[in-house]
Every structure is written in C-alpha cells, then in structure tokens.
C-alpha cells in the first residue's frame, strides 16, 4: 500500500486503484525525451519490491524506503541532526519516480530541506551520504558556495543559506 498525501493507493498487478481523485504532479522523461506527468500508475508499477519494508508510525513507505515529513521548521544542520537522532538521514533523491513521490506528499508550497549541501572542500554539491551530485541529472538554482544548502519547492531545487529555517524530510 502506498500512502500519498492521505490518499491510500492500492497497487495490484501493476495497476492502481484509488478511492479519491488525485491530481498528478512531476515530470517523467520517456524514451523519446519528451516530458509527461508521472501518474499514480507509474508510482505503483515500481513498487513490487516494497512489501517487506516496515516503516515506523507516521512514516510513509515508498520503494523500499521510509520517509518522514516535518511540520516544524529548523536550520539545515538542525534538520540533519534531527534525522540522525532518529536513525535516518535527510532526503537523498535517487530518481525521478522518487522525486515525484516527494512532490505528491509536499502539501505546502514553501521550501523543504533535503540532504544536499555545497562543500567548499570538494567545491561540489554533496549528498549527506558523501556522494557528489550528478550534474547530468540534477539542476540546482542559486549560489554554489560555502554555507549553501539545498531545498526543494514544487519541481525545483534551490540553493539557500544553511541557517535559514525550513521544513525538512527524513529518510531511511
């Protein structure tokens, strides 16, 4: 089962049934390079291996991972610590379907911290697991310098001052 913004999606044999109408968001690249909306069917179709993972209460499960969306606001470093204290980490985005899932669950239009910051030592955007960002996939708008941390808003990733306070997403 997928819980998406309070809507329970049932994935059965690669198809989706959904008790409530849901507006699709997010972009998916298909083979010919054109954009189309990612549908609930797309999200469900990739969930076949999702059945064994158990998530704690108030965490959402998707693609074998668990996600928690904060309601309060903290700086990037405080958000980072908060996730660590709960044996998780700030969100690392792996693919377009995961980003679409995140977008579907972001109810507010404001910035939300993710696990990405600019390290002046490496001079690159780096995920909290230490891996560098793949610039062939990800585009971040805004300053790329010390004290720059990444936040998502709608379908975009922005560079913001790390001391700014936003909501955040934990993942394990």
């Amino acid at each position: 089962l997928l819980v998406s913004q309070g809507v329970l999606l049932k994935c059965q044999k690669g198809s989706c049934s959904n008790a409530t109408q849901y507006e699709d968001t997010g972009d998916l690249k298909v083979n010919n390079g054109t954009r189309r909306n990612i549908s609930n069917k797309d999200l469900c179709a990739s969930r076949s291996a999702d059945q064994t993972v158990l998530c704690q209460s108030e965490w959402l499960k998707y693609q074998g991972k668990c996600y928690w969306f904060s309601n309060e606001m903290k700086s990037w470093s405080d958000s980072y610590v908060y996730c660590l204290e709960r044996k998780s980490h700030l969100l690392i985005i792996h693919d377009q379907l995961e980003m679409a899932f995140i977008q579907k669950n972001l109810r507010q239009l404001n910035y939300v911290w993710i696990g990405l910051n600019f390290t002046s030592l490496k001079m690159t955007w780096t995920w909290v697991d230490g891996s560098p960002i793949d610039s062939k996939i990800f585009f971040i708008k805004g300053p790329a310098k010390e004290n720059s941390c990444a936040a998502i808003k709608e379908s975009k990733i922005f560079s913001e001052t790390c001391s700014s306070v936003f909501k955040w997403i934990c993942q394990y």
């Epitope: 954009r35 377009q96 955007w125 990800f138 585009f139 790329a144 310098k145």
Partner: antibody, heavy 114, light 113 residues
C-alpha cells in the same frame, strides 16, 4: 558588467573560443547564458553555465559548443564552425536572487563570421 | 526542448495605440517566461520576467500575462521609442537538468506609425 571578446573571421572547421569577462559579481552566485543572433534573424539560446560550474546546452547545440569558466570568465568554444554559425554572440547574467531566471544584464555581443 | 511560437511576426500601430503580442509554449512552462525588447545594434533589454513581473525601471505601459502555455505582452499608449523587436523566452527549469533549456520565440517587429 559583461564584455564578450574573441569574435573574428574564421575559416570553416577552425575551432574558435569566445570569452565573456565578468566584473562586479561572482560566477558562484550567478548563472550565465550564451545566446546568438544571425544577421537579420532572431535570438537563439545556446546554453548555460550554472553557479556550480556545470554546463547545460540546447539540444541542437550539444557537441557543437562547449561552455567552460574561470573565476572571472565564461568561455564558449565553437568546436567546428560552419557558415551557419555566423552570428553575433551574447552572454547574459541571471540576477541570481530570484526563483525565476532573470537575465537582466547583457553584454554588447561579439561578431563571428565563418 | 520546449518550442516557443510567437505571433504576429510584425505589427504596425499608431502612436498612442496598443499592441498585443502572443507567445505559445509547446508544453507547460508554468509562469517561467520573460519578455525582451531589442533595437538594432543593441543587446536585448529585459522587460518582464515571471510572466508578469515588470523589471525595475521599465515603463508600466508594458504588461505581461498568462501561464502554462499561453502568454501575452501588451504595450499600451505606444510611443515612437517602442519601435523595436520583441522576444519571449521560456525560463522554465526543474530539478531535472535536461529541462534546463531557455529558448526564445521568433520575435515580433513592432512599427510605430
């Protein structure tokens, strides 16, 4: 300010590098685009140098152009010019402080004739 | 890449008149659209960004509207100095880098009689 340079008369196939020299701001704060305009024609977007040093191109421009940068310059290399590349080449700066891209500072352009 | 289609290619109106220029995107670009004015021998000058936000120092006679795929630039109370070519530009992007392309419309030449 922005100033393009390097435009000249070149023979087809001879690589040419154009330079956009910036002053008064940092390239780690502001993205930069290259745009060209053939004589009597409209504006044509080539690509962008993002604040983190990553370059992205229009589909038609991939392989034909390379964008790179130093601390104060953004270069556009025309890898193998053809007569169709004859144009004035502009660089422009994104204001950087907005969710929208705002290309509000432009150079005067440099003319390339192939 | 998104394709921007601009109409008309030229327009002629008297001083004091109004010109309306339309720009259509081949797919939704939200409100990520800019309008420019260009005069011969000069670089483009930004007029409007975010589809409707007037750039600092630009006359309020210039008005941008629209979102998604349909956009309009309206120039009212035309002055001789408004004679120029006007371009729209998609400034849409997303976290997915291949969406980061900023094409222009074909341009509209405005003649003020």
């Amino acid at each position: 300010s922005l100033e393009e340079s390097g435009g000249r008369l070149v023979t087809p196939g001879t690589p040419l590098t154009l330079t956009c020299t910036v002053s008064g701001f940092s390239l780690s704060n502001n993205g930069m685009i290259w745009v060209r305009q053939a004589p009597g024609e409209g504006l044509e977007y080539i690509g962008i140098m993002n604040t983190d040093g990553s370059a992205y191109y229009a589909s038609w421009a991939k392989g034909r152009f390379t964008i790179s940068r130093t601390s104060t310059t953004v270069d556009l290399k025309i890898t193998s010019p053809t007569t169709e590349d004859t144009a004035t080449y502009f660089c422009a700066r994104d204001a950087g402080s907005n969710e929208h891209f705002v290309f509000n500072l432009w150079g005067q352009g440099t003319l390339v004739t192939v | 890449d998104v394709v921007m289609t601009q109409t008309p290619s030229s327009a002629s109106e008297p001083v004091g008149g109004t010109v309306t220029i339309k720009c259509q995107a081949s797919e939704s670009i939200s409100s990520d659209l800019a309008w420019y004015q260009q005069k011969p021998g000069q670089p483009p000058k930004l007029l409007i960004y975010g589809a409707s936000t007037l750039e600092s120092g630009v006359s309020s006679r210039f008005k941008g509207s629209g979102s998604g795929t349909e956009f309009t630039l309206t120039i009212s109370d035309l002055e001789c100095a408004d004679a120029a070519t006007y371009y729209c530009q998609s400034t849409y992007y997303s976290w997915y880098s291949s969406n980061c392309v900023f094409p222009f419309g074909g341009g509209t030449e405005v003649v003020v009689k």
